[in-house]
Amino acid sequence: LPRWRQQWSGSGTTSRFPETVLARCVKYTEVHPEMRHVDCQSVWDAFKGAFISKYPCNITEEDYQPLVKLGTQTVPCNKTLLWSRIKDLAHQFTQVQRDMFTLEDMLLGYLADDLTWCGEFNTFEINYQSCPDWRKDCSNNPVSVFWKTVSRRFAETACGVVHVMLNGSRSKIFDKNSTFGSVEVHNLQPEKVQALEAWVIHGGREDSRDLCQDPTIKELESIISKRNIRFFCKNIYRPDKFLQCVKNPEDSSCLSGI
């Protein structure tokens, strides 16, 4: 008879999860020679150890500390790019601007990007049927706690001028409940971070409003300023042109505003 298994509201662990994490780790260490020392088997063992055999609504940041230690990486000052609700454009940007880094350009973020995982209490099995949903089941689930943990660490280690890409098409351009708003903003270190520069990405072609005046951006400015970090904001009216100009800065059309 099949074992009884807890039914959660979210989708189950991504198929071939262990193989995918190991493969991504191997690939990352090949592409980034400075990370060649990383033992991917140990990385997987630490990842697995964070959630296997544990009740998936009772995961803590402490559970991920062995993994975080193995994946220690530093980003040069002025090269950190945070994002909120606009992941694809942020990643397209760092694919072109290779000297800037989102969390998903770092080993741990790269390993877990777009994956789902969870285990079950007291068994060594991975649950491929369902995993806890953040809203419907619990917030202390393996995936949410992972991203909270690595996002906190990513923000804590940032230095110089930190950039953040925000989605100007959302009703809340800055959302206090997003990972950026609830974790990263509060873990930037004022003694290391001189400024936060927000890039507000416009959605519509004819949208010429100054979204830097949006009330939620003013709220972000207030939070950042209170933390003794300077705040700047830029409108990116044409994201397609913006990316094109990152690729080809000498293009004559790039001398005008984007």
Epitope: R16, E19, T20, L22, A23, R24, V26, K27, E30, V31, P33, R36, H37, V38, D39, C40, Q41, Q95
Partner: antibody, heavy 117, light 113 residues
Framework: EVQLQQSGAEFVRPGASVKLSCTAS????????MHWVKQRPEQGLEWIGW????????KYAPKFQDEATLTADTSSNTAYLHLSSLTSEDTAIYYC??????????WGQGTLVTVSA | DIVMTQSPSSLSVSAGEKVTMSCKSS????????????LAWYQQKPGQPPKLLIY???TRESGVPDRFTGSGSGTDFTLTISSVQAEDLAVYYC?????????FGGGTKLEIK
Amino acid sequence: EVQLQQSGAEFVRPGASVKLSCTASGFNIKDSLMHWVKQRPEQGLEWIGWIDPEDDKTKYAPKFQDEATLTADTSSNTAYLHLSSLTSEDTAIYYCARRFLRGFAYWGQGTLVTVSA
Amino acid sequence: DIVMTQSPSSLSVSAGEKVTMSCKSSQSLLNSGNQKNYLAWYQQKPGQPPKLLIYGASTRESGVPDRFTGSGSGTDFTLTISSVQAEDLAVYYCQNDHSYPYTFGGGTKLEIK
């Protein structure tokens, strides 16, 4: 189960070009680098280079920089090796391979390319 | 490029005998970050692709018989077959897995008397 299935043998004239394929199963090629290795008759192994199918970034051994072109199609989970201006020196078995942990743990069966007038 | 030199180029032994083959690299394959050697050994039987035997200079790939042992560090490495079997007839290659471009040794051809 991880498998790398390569295209069939090619017999080509000098100066012509050829495109070899390597179709992966059991894993998503976006999550790995796809490597190619050359083995001339009765000789050793030479690493040609790799492609990252996720972003089409490539790395070549200096010797093959101008001789080989690596591409990939993620929709069909296939990597390609394009060889142009072929000479008798290009007569060889070409393998696609995938590293896992350390070392090339998975290999295709190889494609024999014969260049002859 | 790191040059990999294997010796002997061929050897002939009787079944049950112990065999050792050498591989020398022109630069150290020791990773200073983790003190591990990035060297792999492969076995290639006639008409087949190479098969990974050993990685990290001494770690046996799963499914590889324990008569195969890898040892060495830095620039000098050895593959030992403790008791050669008839099915071990093959060419054995070492590979620099440390830095680009990856390079292979010229191979050691093992023949069974």
